[in-house]
Interface confidence: low
């Protein structure tokens, strides 16, 4: 027969869960022991793996609520394909029964006395109500019994006496004008307001009680403008340190508008809240140093050869710097004094040139003369040998970078009659005066 | 006057480390240049590492590059050189120096020297 097929089995509820399908058979749907089937929507789920027990359901409650009866609980053989110990087959349900006991005793009514007498009516004047009570002893009830019915009942009374009225009073008049149009002066403002007890009065006979409280009331005035205060100076403060250490520096004064502070519109104090003086600590501020420009770079020479130029043999040069202006001890200039790199020298080379595109136009000369022209060449551009790029000078040190150094001496072709730089020029139009721009100014 | 003591040298073999200190006293400016110097028997003197005191600029011999380190402790007034992966050719007298001027590197005309300590590396 067709089954439903699910992919788990919940141990815990002994529920299918993940509906894979129906339709299909029990011996397909189990090919993986982790399904599970149920023969019909709702019915008992089975597990595929092999049977076993299921774990004892809770107990089901007592069959009394009172004294001795019997509960019963149960477990069910389940999975496919085999038995449970004691050869049962899956499905099968095998129960324990045992007794228990929730309330030892069952519970038994109880019986009422006679009613007891009329307590006083509720109130000393008009209507109100008395009440009178029975108790549940005639039997007492027995194992958490009761009496049937209620314990006590009210009629109505009547005392046949009039209440007397009450005072009450009526509603506050309006607050009357301030004492004052500011607060904080000699005299705290106040404002006062008044009620009268005649809602309603209290009655003559019987006699009411008069109102409780005061007839009348006073509070400070709210919402007033505080009264202005004018500011006063407090006195000099200390002189502040030097604030530099060397060179001249400025101290300062300080005084506070706070004797006393000026208050709600009260004038701040007439006056400066600083003085300043100036300080010398006669001590020269120290100057650091700084590098001059490189100098120029120098021949590019190998130790023990008289001449590298226009060879293929990688040499030295150095350039220096000066570290200049360096005064009372201020700082010394950082890094090397020295620039090392290797080259190969091209001084004085006849090399192999060609002529470079136009330069850019350059700067109009004189700026400030008369006939101002502008410029642009064409160099005659020697072509650089091909070098090693890079050396090896020791052993295990690691390549270096070899620079071209010294004036070659290129050849081309002439141009415009010309062997190494060819010029053309212009004159610049519409110039502006040179002027001073700080005249220009005033 | 200025005095550099050094220490911490020793015999090691070929692969181990050493920590070699130098004690200054007597140095009042704030700048300058320390440096460590060494010298094999029957070779020059030569610069080994430098640093600029109370800053971090250095510079190292090729030779010794990634291997050693030099530090200060300005607090304590103390120069360090730790010397790891040693070899046989690190066999030397070991020199702190000093001075006010620049540029920091290993050229030998510094103006104040320890008495030195011996380094030997085995093989």
């Known amino acids: 027969d067709p089954v439903l097929c699910f992919t788990q089995y919940e141990e815990s509820s002994g529920k299918c869960k993940g509906l894979l399908g129906g339709g299909v058979s029990v011996e397909d749907c189990c090919l993986n022991t982790a399904f599970a089937y149920q023969k019909r929507s709702g019915g008992l789920c089975q597990p595929c793996r092999s049977p076993r027990w299921s774990l004892w359901s809770t107990w089901a409650p007592c069959s009394v609520t009172c004294s001795e009866g019997s509960q019963l609980r149960y477990r069910r053989c389940v999975g496919w394909n085999g038995q449970c110990s004691g050869k049962v087959a899956p499905g099968t349900l095998e129960w324990q029964l045992q007794a228990c006991e929730d309330q030892q005793c069952c519970p038994e009514m109880g019986g009422w006395s006679g009613w007891g007498p009329w307590e006083p009516c509720s109130v000393t004047c008009s209507k109100g109500t008395r009440t009178r009570r029975r108790a549940c002893n005639h039997p007492a009830p027995k194992c958490g019994g009761h009496c049937p019915g209620q314990a006590q009942e009210s009629e109505a009374c009547d005392t046949q006496q009039v209440c007397p009225t009450h005072g009450a009073w009526a509603t506050w008049g309006p607050w009357t004008p301030c004492s004052a149009s500011c607060h904080g002066g000699p005299h705290e403002p106040k404002e006062t307001r008044s009620r009268k007890c005649s809602a309603p009065e209290p009655s003559q006979k019987p006699p009411g009680k008069p109102c409780p409280g005061l007839a009348y009331e006073q509070r400070r005035c709210t919402g007033l403008p505080p009264c202005p205060v004018a500011g006063g100076w407090g006195p000099w403060g200390p002189v502040s340190p030097c604030p530099v250490t060397c060179g001249l520096g400025q101290t300062m004064e300080q005084r506070t508008c706070n004797h006393p502070v000026p208050q709600h519109g009260g004038p701040f104090c007439a006056g400066d809240a600083t003085r300043t003086h100036i300080c010398n600590t006669a001590v020269p501020c120290p100057v650091d140093g700084e590098w001059d420009s490189w100098g120029e770079w120098s021949p590019c020479i190998r130790r023990n050869m008289k001449s590298i130029s226009c060879q293929e043999i990688p040499g030295q040069q150095s350039r220096g710097r000066t570290c200049r202006g360096r005064k009372f001890d201020g700082h010394r200039c950082a890094g090397q004094q020295q620039d090392i790199r290797h080259c190969y020298s091209i001084q004085h080379c006849p090399l192999k040139g060609s002529w470079s595109e136009w330069s850019t136009w350059g700067l109009c000369m004189p700026p400030c003369g008369p006939n101002p022209t502008r410029a642009r060449q064409r160099l005659c551009t020697p072509l650089l040998p091909k070098y090693p790029p890079t050396v090896s000078m020791v052993e295990g040190q690691g390549e270096k970078n070899v620079t071209f150094w010294g004036r070659p001496l290129p050849r081309c072709e002439e141009l415009q009659g010309q062997k190494l730089v060819v010029e053309e020029k212009r004159p610049c139009l519409h110039v502006p005066a040179c002027k001073d721009p700080e005249e220009e100014e005033l | 006057q200025v005095q550099l003591v050094e220490s911490g040298g020793g015999s090691v073999h070929a692969g181990g480390s050493l920590r070699l200190s130098c004690a200054v006293s007597?140095?009042?400016?704030?700048?300058?240049?320390m440096a460590w110097f060494r010298q094999a028997p029957g070779k020059e003197r030569e610069g080994v590492a430098s640093i600029i005191r109370g800053e971090r600029g250095e510079w190292y011999a090729d030779s010794v590059k990634g291997r050693f380190t030099i530090s200060q402790d300005n607090a304590e007034n103390t120069l360090y050189l730790q010397m790891n992966s040693l070899k046989s050719e690190d066999t030397a007298m070991y020199y702190c120096a000093a001075d006010y001027r620049y540029p920091c590197d290993g050229r030998s005309n510094y103006d104040y020297w320890g008495q030195g300590t011996q380094v030997t590396v085995s093989s």
């Open positions: 007597g140095y009042t400016h704030s700048t300058g240049c």
